[in-house]
Interface confidence: medium
């Protein structure tokens, strides 16, 4: 597969209410189960149909979960992370990292599993700057007419 895959990385706080069958998603990851190379973080691998997460609609497959009820998920064994979710109570607050694909180019390949991405400001700032330069140039051109 050729081409570079770039991502906008955004974070979101998602508050879920545990449903009759729980929170309704699966996870992979942990210090003993690094699925993403060089990253022992916890990732959402399945959203179960009609579960609490699916009905809420914000959590997506591939999201990285940074914390549960304020507790950081860094450097946890896989089963310890699972237990943290299972013991999280009725109302569960998740801090999650979404990755939105923004570009496919022919310059190498980042790899689908690589969690690194482009912060949103790194895309928006150059776009804003270009827009301002174009507007300035247009105004100068109109003045010359």
């Amino acid at each position: 597969m050729n081409g570079r895959v770039d991502y906008l990385v955004t974070e979101e706080e998602i508050n879920l209410t545990r449903g009759p069958s729980g929170l309704g998603f699966n996870i992979v990851g942990g210090t003993d189960q690094q699925y993403v190379s060089n990253d022992s973080g916890i990732y959402v691998s399945r959203i179960k149909e009609n579960g609490a997460a699916a009905l809420d609609g914000r959590l997506q497959e591939g999201d990285k979960i940074l914390s549960v009820n304020g507790q950081d998920l860094k450097n946890l064994l896989h089963q310890d992370a699972v237990d943290l979710f299972r013991n999280a109570g009725y109302a569960v607050s998740l801090r999650v990292q979404h990755r939105l694909q923004v570009q496919n180019g022919p310059i190498g390949h980042r790899g689908e599993g690589d969690p690194s991405g482009i912060p949103i400001f790194m895309v928006l700032v150059p776009v804003f700057a270009l827009t301002m330069v174009a507007a300035w140039a247009f105004m100068r051109y109109r003045q010359q007419l």
Epitope: L23, N26, I27, G62, N104
Partner: nanobody, 131 residues
């Protein structure tokens, strides 16, 4: 997120062998290795039934009693492909065989058996006829 295409079906004599393949096209930003994969079959006039499954990591496999000892499920994550090798085929193995996928990993709610739960994505099926 996942499109599945099965191949390898056909007409085979009783006692023969077949290898079914299922190639997955995974949405960008996802990886095939995150999905549990399964094979199901549906004979004419019967309900679709579980045949075999393999966990997302490949570390666990599950088989229906009807095919245990005669079939082997395997996966090649580099090729986005899951296989079902079927040996000593019987006329009662005649069916449309479907490949299925669902996100793997561990449920944050409760432990479960890969072979027993509903799957999220399905292929169109490949016909296997044992004469």
């Amino acid at each position: 997120h996942v499109q599945l295409v099965e191949s390898g079906g056909g007409l085979v004599q009783a006692g023969g062998s077949l290898r079914l393949s299922c190639v997955a096209s995974v949405a960008s930003g996802r990886t095939f290795g995150w999905y549990d994969m399964g094979w199901f079959r549906q004979a004419p006039g019967k309900e679709r039934e579980f045949v075999a499954a393999i966990s997302w990591s490949g570390g666990s496999t599950y088989y229906a009693d009807s095919v245990k000892g005669r079939s082997t499920i395997s996966r090649d994550n580099a090729k986005n492909t899951v296989y079902l090798q079927m040996n000593s085929l019987k006329p009662e193995d005649t069916a449309v065989y479907y490949c299925a996928a669902r996100g793997g990993g561990t449920s944050v709610d409760s432990d479960y058996d890969v072979g027993e739960f509903e799957y999220d994505y399905w292929g169109q099926g490949t016909q296997v006829t044992v004469s």
